[in-house]
């Protein structure tokens, strides 16, 4: 393919560059299902948006293969802890791929936030942030899970969120 | 506009791509004003820089509209806490826009770091990191606030910082 | 240089854009040396990759000068703490440059995670995340250090990691 072909590719690249895939999804009242599934997210209202990525049942769905910086923050908090000081929270980003039946761990954090609360009546807050670059194929999905999700605090979409952009 | 116009656009894009907006601002002795305003930042010395973004009174000012990954880290620490275990820190990134009189919360964390100080040692350290993608228009500003800012520790610009880049 | 030269530059840019430098390195059993050196990382297996960056003895080595978002997360944990409840952990990203004999601090966090354990036998978990934009020249290196590295917990490459991408 000669200069014309290259030209077309450049035009294409410029257009695609204008829509470099990116998304930022925010926490909402419906995020915590209690069903054992992943967290669900707001995709349109307020600060939430999807650009070159799609969404399905809690998952960011990749439409263009490549390397993505994916991230999530969850706001944790409570009055005391359901399991006392031994409570551990696992916050993770997981990949679903048609080529494998189980979710694959991508980025994970474990925290023991309740050591900050020394009695059952003590109010405490903590936050967990994850971010890193992973390769994702078209059709693959990324979800956020938190165990124990009873400790996730949602309010207005600014404290718990999930996003990605191609690098 | 024919190929020539497209060519100009591509040339323009290449030039602008060379200066994809980005900034990293660092904490300094003057960062904590105690006035209730946002944190102030170093913009030139050491690791700090501005490229395609400007700065005004603590704010990163957007010159080119688009989606930006914005981030901030603050180093927290102290000897004891002003309100004991009940002390809560709120660390947030906020948007100022000419179209709205009040600041808009973008990304926020709450932490109760003072449980990290124990009976045998009153000294404690903690850190709060925020990052996420938001859409910003030209002329809009982003600032960092920390409440209670008495618990922010500044030293050499590596522990508390604020930055952004276009995605 | 006329249009042809500009054309070549654009073609070159497109090609280089396809390999925008990026890397994600993961924690492994060999990461913790106990030698006082930086953490070592997996570069190929699982989620780890290098694209337009190289690796040498724990360091990401820059081949193309520019601004990079660099990041690292370490998973911390233990049963009690080696220095008691006063233990402080310093997690940092440091630059090595041929132009200067000592490592330069880029991004640093200090945490006192052991306050989360209320007795010497208490299991605790904590996590530290760092990320920020820095300018790196070709040949410069970035490493991760954790003091006290005895508190870093490695498992499967998802909990402790190190990465970068050009912005």
């Amino acid at each position: 393919d000669g200069p014309a072909g290259s030209w077309e590719q450049l035009i294409q690249e410029r257009r695609s560059h204008e829509v470099n895939p990116a998304a930022h999804l925010t926490g909402a009242n419906s995020s915590l299902t209690g069903s054992g599934g992943p967290l669900l997210w707001e995709t349109q209202l307020g600060l939430a948006f999807l650009r070159g990525l799609s969404y399905h049942d809690g998952a960011l769905v990749v439409t263009k293969a490549g390397y993505y910086y994916i991230y999530s923050k969850v706001q944790l908090g409570g009055v005391g802890c359901p399991l006392g000081l031994a409570s551990t929270i696992t916050h993770g980003l997981y990949k679903r791929t048609p080529r494998y039946p189980e979710e694959l761990e991508l980025l994970v954090s474990q925290q023991s936030p309740c050591g900050r609360a020394t009695s059952s009546s003590r109010v405490w807050w903590d936050s967990s942030f994850l971010g890193g670059v992973v390769h994702l194929e078209a059709g693959e999905e990324v979800v956020v899970r938190v165990l124990d999700e009873r400790l996730v605090r949602l309010r207005d979409g600014t404290r718990s969120y999930f996003g990605a952009f191609m690098v | 506009d024919g190929p020539a116009g497209s060519w100009e656009q591509l040339i323009q894009e290449r030039r602008s791509h060379e200066v994809n907006p980005a900034a990293h601002l660092t904490g300094a002795n003057s960062s904590l004003t105690g006035s209730g305003g946002p944190l102030l930042w170093e913009t030139q010395l050491g690791l700090a820089f501005l490229r395609g973004l400007s700065y005004h009174d603590g704010a990163l000012v957007v010159t080119k509209a688009g989606y930006y990954y914005i981030y901030s880290k603050v180093q927290l620490g102290g000897v004891g806490c002003p309100l004991g275990l009940a002390s809560t820190i709120t660390h947030g990134l906020y948007k100022r826009t000419p179209r709205y009189p009040e600041e808009l919360e973008l990304l926020v964390s709450q932490q109760s770091p003072c449980g990290r100080a124990t009976s045998s040692s009153r000294v404690w350290w903690d850190s709060s990191f925020l990052g996420g993608v938001v859409h910003l228009e030209a002329g809009e500003e982003v600032v960092v606030r920390v409440l209670d800012e008495r618990l922010v520790r500044l030293r050499d610009g590596t522990r508390s910082y604020f930055g952004a880049f276009m995605v | 240089d006329g249009p042809a030269g500009s054309w070549e530059q654009l073609i070159q840019e497109r090609r280089s854009h396809e390999v925008n430098p990026a890397a994600h390195l993961t924690g492994a059993n060999s990461s913790l040396t106990g030698s006082g050196g930086p953490l070592l990382w997996e570069t190929q297996l699982g989620l780890a990759f290098l694209r337009g960056l190289s690796y040498h003895d724990g360091a990401l080595v820059v081949t193309k000068a520019g601004y990079y978002y660099i990041y690292s997360k370490v998973q911390l944990g233990g049963v009690g703490c080696p220095l008691g409840l006063a233990s402080t952990i310093t997690h940092g990203l440091y630059k090595r440059t041929p132009r200067y004999p000592e490592e330069l601090e880029l991004l640093v966090s200090q945490q006192s995670p052991c306050g989360r354990a209320t007795s010497s036998s208490r299991v605790w978990w904590d996590s530290s995340f760092l990320g920020g934009v820095v300018h790196l020249e070709a040949g410069e290196e970035v490493v991760v250090r954790v003091l006290d590295e005895r508190l870093v917990r490695l498992r499967d490459g998802t909990r402790s990691y190190f990465g970068a991408f050009m912005v």
Epitope: - | G77, V79, G80, P82, R153 | -
Partner: antibody
């Protein structure tokens, strides 16, 4: 202006208890720690502990653990220090001292309450 | 506990002359470049009064003839020009660690 007003002098027998009050005014009561310090005759100053009015959380000097109790009544902006199992060496002037804005010093003090323990 | 040792125990200085009181801690009272050391003045029949906090910061309303210096374990309170109203007992106090502890006090008199 900031004021800390303490209750009046007390005379107690060994083994008894005493409760000293400290009423605060002129500032936002819950925003500042309250410390208790005593000075025995011919001795120096001795820190007994602190209370956080916002939550009622307390930290005690180990020496007074189990004998001293600090409480707070937010409705009247008053803190209390109760010392039990009194002995003659507890004879002292007891002060409340407000934690400063940066909380690791005491910037305002009550006038003091003399507690005399004598059989 | 951190032991605070003041010297001298008493000090007689002429009016208008400099008075210097030293305080030594049994371990460092520094954290992140800040010294958790305070100085108080106590006159007979009165509560203590804060003069200096964080080793060298003058409390609001305190005359600037008072100054503090030092870091780590060694600290100094200086009265640059002694006035009659400065006759009192002066205490150093550390707040880096519980229990907060005071020095034994230094009595300042007029020579």
């Amino acid at each position: 202006q900031v004021q800390l007003v303490q209750s009046g002098a007390e005379v107690k027998k060994p083994g008894a208890s005493v409760k000293v009050s400290c009423k605060a005014s002129g500032y936002t009561f819950i925003d500042h720690i309250m410390n208790w310090v005593r000075k025995a005759p011919g001795q120096g100053l001795e820190w007994m502990g602190r209370i956080y009015p916002v939550s009622g959380e307390t930290n005690y000097n180990q020496k007074f653990m189990g004998r001293a109790t600090f409480t707070v009544d937010r409705s009247t902006s008053t803190v209390y220090m109760e010392l039990s199992s009194l002995r003659s060496e507890d004879t002292a002037v007891y002060y409340c001292g407000r934690g400063s804005y940066y909380w690791n010093a005491m910037d305002y003090w009550g006038q003091g309450t003399l507690v005399t323990v004598s059989s | 506990d951190i032991v605070m040792t003041q010297s001298p125990d008493s000090l007689a200085v002429s009016l208008g002359e400099r008075a210097t009181i030293n305080c030594k801690a049994s371990q460092s009272v520094d954290f992140d470049g800040e010294s958790y050391m305070n100085w108080y003045q106590q006159k007979p029949g009165q509560p203590p009064k804060l003069l200096i906090y964080s080793a060298s910061n003058l409390e609001s309303g305190v005359p600037d003839r008072f100054s503090g210096s030092g870091s780590g374990t060694d600290f100094t309170l200086t009265i640059s020009s002694l006035q009659a109203e400065d006759v009192a007992v002066y205490y150093c106090q550390q707040s880096i660690e519980d229990p907060w502890t005071f020095g034994q006090g230094t009595k300042v008199e007029i020579k």
